[in-house]
Interface confidence: low
């Protein structure tokens, strides 16, 4: 009698490893013999497909060499024209050892940002992914999480997160390890110890100290009043990612010193700054307080101005008086480069004789100050415009201290040659006869605060300013 097909052995789930054989059995009872077809994921398997073997009148389907892509739902359908077609389905579970398809890579990240180390896996059963840092399993916390994809996400990266990482993919068939990768945490430059401001006496040695850290270790540069430091010695040391820089300065003028710590992150830089001011304590000490000794001038700057083999006063309040006083003259002299040709020779004479004062040897060597009259001649005649500009800058606070006045005496505090001709020194370069002096035009619109007396004539002039030149 004709009998509709009945599947007596329903398909079961088949587990198979890659490259193994997998067989589905679909036992059918019917009369007449049924036609059996097979589908995978609802797509018909063709009889001539060489990857499959269909035997026992279609009741056995064999996959000859299982591939990862063979997983899916396999169904057999039996039909003999009697009654309806019958179907049974089962799954092929392609079992696969874990495989890391997208391994982690080395990462450089700035502290505080988010880092993601990839670790994409394949395998069946689905591998569980864990991570190892150094030699220990990595513990997840509020910042550190293993994502569903297997990737490691670290929020708000910290310095201590730096190290060697590898991911581990594990299932019942085995374990796969990624290569070891490095997470490098870079840290913006930061100043740990800022240089301190100082108020010192002229000619002092001061050490400014600046300490910075960062990853990579920053470099430190020093800036003086907006420009790269031109003088002074810099000593640096690096220990445990901390750079220590010491700038030793010989103080001849006030300034703003800035320590700049810089490090590089890829194409970008991070910078930290700290500044300190160096100011000079008030200079106008009474001359009698000075302590020092007489010595022949051996410098270079004032050679043309001071008399040959002149005996000058060297002030022992400096560690090295000769060097300190020469440096002071040199600093002031550089500023004279921009003054007028009328002012410059007079100002050079004044500052050389003021800094390297004539010395009176004796039991107590004494400096002989410049006579007031000569000082006023420079201030009110030769350098009137320049003096005004300088005083205006001082009043407006453009100079941080009286430094620029140090190289120029306060005329009113100097002794007059009319009180005691031996108590003060003359500037031979400014000696004129009365006739010449009368021809000087007023060089400022303001009336001189002090009447300028006649300067006595002197035959010891090494140069003179021609009256004709002075009048133009």
């Amino acid at each position: 009698l004709p009998k509709a097909p009945v599947i007596t052995t329903p398909l079961e789930t088949v587990d198979a490893l890659v490259e193994e054989v997998a067989t589905f059995m679909c036992a059918v009872e019917s009369y007449p013999q049924p036609e059996i077809s097979w589908t995978r994921n609802k797509i018909l398997i063709k009889l001539f497909d060489t990857r499959y073997s269909i035997r026992e009148n279609g009741q056995l389907l064999t996959i000859l060499s299982v591939e990862d892509s063979d997983d899916g739902i396999y169904c057999c359908t039996a039909n003999n024209g009697v009654g309806g077609a019958v179907e049974s389905c089962g799954a092929l579970q392609v079992k696969m050892k874990p495989k890391i398809t997208r391994p982690p890579i080395n990462v450089k990240i700035i502290e505080g940002l988010k880092a993601v180390l990839p670790c994409t896996t394949m395998g069946n059963p689905k591998p569980s992914v864990s991570w190892i840092k150094g030699d220990s399993p990595l513990r997840e916390n509020s910042r550190i999480a293993v994502l569903e994809s297997g990737s490691l996400r670290i929020h708000n990266v910290q310095k201590e997160d730096a190290g060697q990482y590898r991911c581990v993919a594990k299932n019942s068939l085995g374990t796969a390890y990624s290569k070891v990768v490095k997470l490098e945490v870079e840290v913006f430059a930061r100043i740990l110890r800022a240089p301190e401001s100082h108020n010192v006496t002229f000619g002092s040695f001061v050490t400014l100290h600046c300490t910075a850290t960062g990853i990579p270790v920053p470099t430190i540069t020093w800036i003086e009043n907006g420009n790269a430091v031109s003088s002074g010695s810099i000593q640096e040391s690096v220990k445990d990612r901390v750079i220590d820089s010491r700038l030793q300065l010989f103080i001849t003028k006030p300034g703003l010193y800035t320590c700049i710590a810089t490090n590089k992150h890829g194409e970008k830089f991070s910078t930290a700054k700290a500044a300190a001011t160096i100011s000079i304590a008030e200079w106008s000490k009474p001359q009698k307080d000075n302590k020092g000794y007489c010595a022949q001038y051996r410098g270079e700057v004032c050679n043309a101005v001071l008399a040959k083999d002149a005996l000058v006063f060297l002030n022992t309040s400096y560690a090295d008086p000769e060097e300190a006083q020469e440096l002071l003259v040199h600093t002031a002299w550089n500023e004279l480069k921009v003054v007028s040709p009328v002012c410059r020779p007079a100002a050079e004479a004044l500052l050389c004789n003021h800094i390297f004062q004539e010395c009176s040897p004796g039991v107590v060597p004494t400096p002989i100050p410049i006579c007031r009259e000569y000082c006023l001649a420079v201030k009110e005649l030769f350098c009137a415009k320049e003096w005004l500009v300088m005083e205006e800058k001082t009043h407006r606070g453009l100079y941080r201290s009286e430094m620029h006045l140090l190289s120029v005496p306060e005329c009113s505090k100097l002794p007059s040659m009319h009180w005691d001709p031996t108590a003060c020194a003359r500037l031979p370069h400014l000696d004129y006869n009365k006739e010449n002096l009368k021809t000087f035009p007023p060089m400022t619109s303001s009336k001189p605060s002090v009447d300028i007396p006649n300067l006595p004539s002197s035959s010891s002039s090494s140069f003179s300013v021609s009256p004709t030149y002075s009048m133009t």
Epitope: T13, D71, G90, A91
Partner: antibody
């Protein structure tokens, strides 16, 4: 990090309506299927409905067919359950859950619900 | 609809015990069975899918097996955190169904 967050629960009278939302994040919503499962106080789990975000196909438990509608807005990564003609026996904590996704067809086909929201309470009472 | 009959409805066990929970499907569901753990006031957690595949991150003391339409969840050595209610679930048809649950209590 995969997250599902339900909202929209509350107290409603019999015959009333309520719309539950399930906001998803941390996975590809458009290639997943979302399920609603409920649990009456002190009882077991009961599957309610499901939607495949990619195809839009839906399924419903017999107990809610014709009264509840499941939908999804892939642009907002959100699934919804519109509940009409509510009855006292609909009182439950409603969970949304994601069907396990795998690169293996069989594992997805046979997969369970691997991520669940925290649940939202729906009380139907006069 | 496919019915999932779970047994026992509750059991008492001690830490270290081997615990077995079974589920029987009313018709063939192939291997489309999953197991869940649920603790009071919390959402269920997936333990096993595809009848015997251990879900990622689940301790290896949990295992699943199938024999025809009978499905078993085994906890090889019960731990204090394992006291909870366990559910089986089939997804062979588009209409999913759960077992009624098994409550595992401390003896």
């Amino acid at each position: 990090e995969v997250q599902l967050v339900e909202s929209g629960g509350g107290l409603v009278q019999p015959g009333g309506s309520l719309r539950l939302s399930c906001a998803a994040s941390g996975f590809t919503f458009s290639s997943s299927s979302i399920h609603w499962v409920r649990q009456a106080p002190g009882k077991g789990l009961e599957w309610v409905a499901s939607i495949s975000s990619s195809s839009g196909s839906t399924s419903y438990a017999d107990s809610v067919k014709g009264r509840f509608t499941i939908s999804a807005d892939t642009s907002k990564n959100t699934a919804y359950l519109q509940m009409n003609s509510l009855r006292a026996e609909d009182t439950a904590v409603y969970y949304c859950a994601r069907k396990y996704w795998s690169q293996y067809y069989w594992a997805h086909y046979y997969g369970g619900l691997d991520y669940w929201g925290q649940g939202t309470l729906v009380t139907v009472s006069s | 609809d496919i019915q999932m009959t779970q047994s026992p409805s509750s059991l008492s066990a001690s830490v270290g015990d081997r615990v077995t929970i079974t589920c029987r499907a009313s018709q063939s569901v192939s291997s489309a069975v999953a197991w869940y753990q649920q603790k009071p006031g919390k959402a269920p957690k997936l333990l096993i899918y595809s009848a015997s595949s251990l879900y990622s991150g689940v301790p290896s003391r949990f295992s699943g097996s199938r024999s025809g339409t009978d499905f078993t969840l085994t906890i090889s050595s019960l731990q204090p955190e394992d006291f909870a209610t366990y559910y089986c679930q089939q997804s062979s048809s588009s209409l999913i169904t759960f077992g009624q649950g098994t409550k595992v209590e401390i003896k």
